[in-house]
Amino acid sequence: DLKVEMMAGGTQITPLNDNVTIFCNIFYSQPLNITSMGITWFWKSLTFDKEVKVFEFFGDHQEAFRPGAIVSPWRLKSGDASLRLPGIQLEEAGEYRCEVVVTPLKAQGTVQLEVVASPASRLLLDQVGMKENEDKYMCESSGFYPEAINITWEKQTQKFPHPIEISEDVITGPTIKNMDGTFNVTSCLKLNSSQEDPGTVYQCVVRHASLHTPLRSNFTLTAARHSLSETEKTDNFS
């Protein structure tokens, strides 16, 4: 009996530019002889419904169709037919199929590969064209993929130390697509500093599929309107 096992759940998520290993394990009732077996990896893009060959291993000879694609011949002996792709790109997401032939038997498995890019976040203070006592803080998130992203603003005062979400005076712009396929977006918070308590901590909170925990950038409102503590300047402002 010949069986192929791929990633549990049928989906693998990998960061952009990572050296990804797409799992494929072979289970066979007898010891594997790699000189008399064949492995073929296929890829079907998300954008066009055509399956193309990425890698082929047959009779101890291997052929890479994508630069750097490789199945370790050493690991193959113990049934590991995982495909390694260095420097994975957004466009290489899609369905990967591992086909194993141990004559006369054939087995295959498929997995969806999702390529994600984590956002980088920075805070900026924009005072251009603002009225007296009014400040505009911009939270820029850049280089993320997929497009779906959630940006919120929170504040913590000395009276209420638990974060409170701010819903007023927040404007989040449209997502902009970069040349490399990733996205950028900016969210703005308008503050009237005369109506806010000094010591209030404001946070821009970014949630994205690529992040295990939200990305937080913060600033503290001080008595002197625009002065920021050194730690805030160093850690959160570019």
């Epitope: 066009f48 055509k50 291997q62 052929e63 169709f65 750097g68 694609a69 490789i70 260095p86 466009e91």
Partner: antibody, heavy 118, light 107 residues
Framework: QIQLQQSGPELVKPGASVKLSCKTS????????ISWLKQKPGQSLEWIAW????????NYNQKFTGKAQLTVDTSSSTAYMQFSSLTTEDSAIYYC???????????WGQGTLVTVSA | DIQMTQTTSSLSASLGDRVTISCRAS??????LNWYQQKPDGTVKVLIY???RLYSGVPSRFSGSGSGTDYSLTISNLEQEDIATYFC?????????FGGGTKLEIK
């Protein structure tokens, strides 16, 4: 038989652009990747980028982003690399290559010498 | 980027000699190491891939070994046609990088 035939030598002025070609045969071009590499006289090789002919998707070495631009013409099975804002540092032999048995650069073109001189 | 270092830039040997060319990576490249031969006319071909696997049609006098950061190419019985420059290349991480090359000459 897999073949990659590159265009002839180029003498160009600083600031100009040059477009090199790599005509292929012996394999299915539309589902292949073509890489470009640079070798300055008497020096080592540098990987510039690759292009997937099926979609035109590219992957660049950051060092060459903005300097090199890769394109393909599937009807003639030809890959192109345009090098812009040339300086004397760009004087080199440029190779096209495609992956094969175990290697990202298994089949090579004969190289094109580009000389940048005023 | 991963730096590849070939400490010997040129090497002189006699026909029939056993020649070893070494290559060091700036970090562990997990055996993703290929060797190329460049003839004086500029022609390039692959000799070895994945550290030790002989490319189709390459004579068996060529062999490769190594692990981690240190790798070597051995020519067991040097022939006239082996006069060339040899480059190592890491295939572990993009951008792919090459060693500076070792030029092999006849004594």
């Amino acid at each position: 038989q897999i073949q990659l035939q590159q265009s002839g030598p180029e003498l160009v002025k600083p600031g100009a652009s040059v477009k090199l070609s790599c005509k292929t045969s012996g394999f299915t071009f539309s589902s292949s990747y073509i890489s470009w590499l640079k070798q300055k006289p008497g020096q080592s090789l540098e990987w510039i980028a690759w292009i997937y002919a099926g979609t035109g998707n590219t992957n660049y070495n950051q060092k060459f982003t903005g300097k090199a631009q890769l394109t393909v013409d599937t009807s003639s099975s030809t890959a192109y690399m345009q090098f812009s804002s040339l300086t004397t540092e760009d004087s080199a032999i440029y190779y096209c290559a495609r992956p094969g048995e175990g290697s990202p650069f298994a089949y090579w073109g004969q190289g094109t010498l580009v000389t940048v001189s005023a | 980027d991963i730096q590849m270092t070939q400490t010997t830039s040129s090497l002189s040997a006699s026909l029939g000699d056993r020649v070893t060319i070494s290559c060091r990576a700036s970090q562990d490249i997990s055996n993703y190491l290929n060797w190329y031969q460049q003839k004086p006319d500029g022609t390039v071909k692959v000799l070895i891939y994945y550290t030790s696997r002989l490319y189709s049609g390459v004579p068996s006098r060529f062999s490769g070994s190594g692990s981690g950061t240190d790798y070597s190419l051995t020519i067991s019985n040097l022939e006239q046609e082996d006069i060339a420059t040899y480059f190592c290349q890491q295939g572990d991480t993009l951008p792919y990088t090459f060693g500076g090359g070792t030029k092999l000459e006849i004594k």
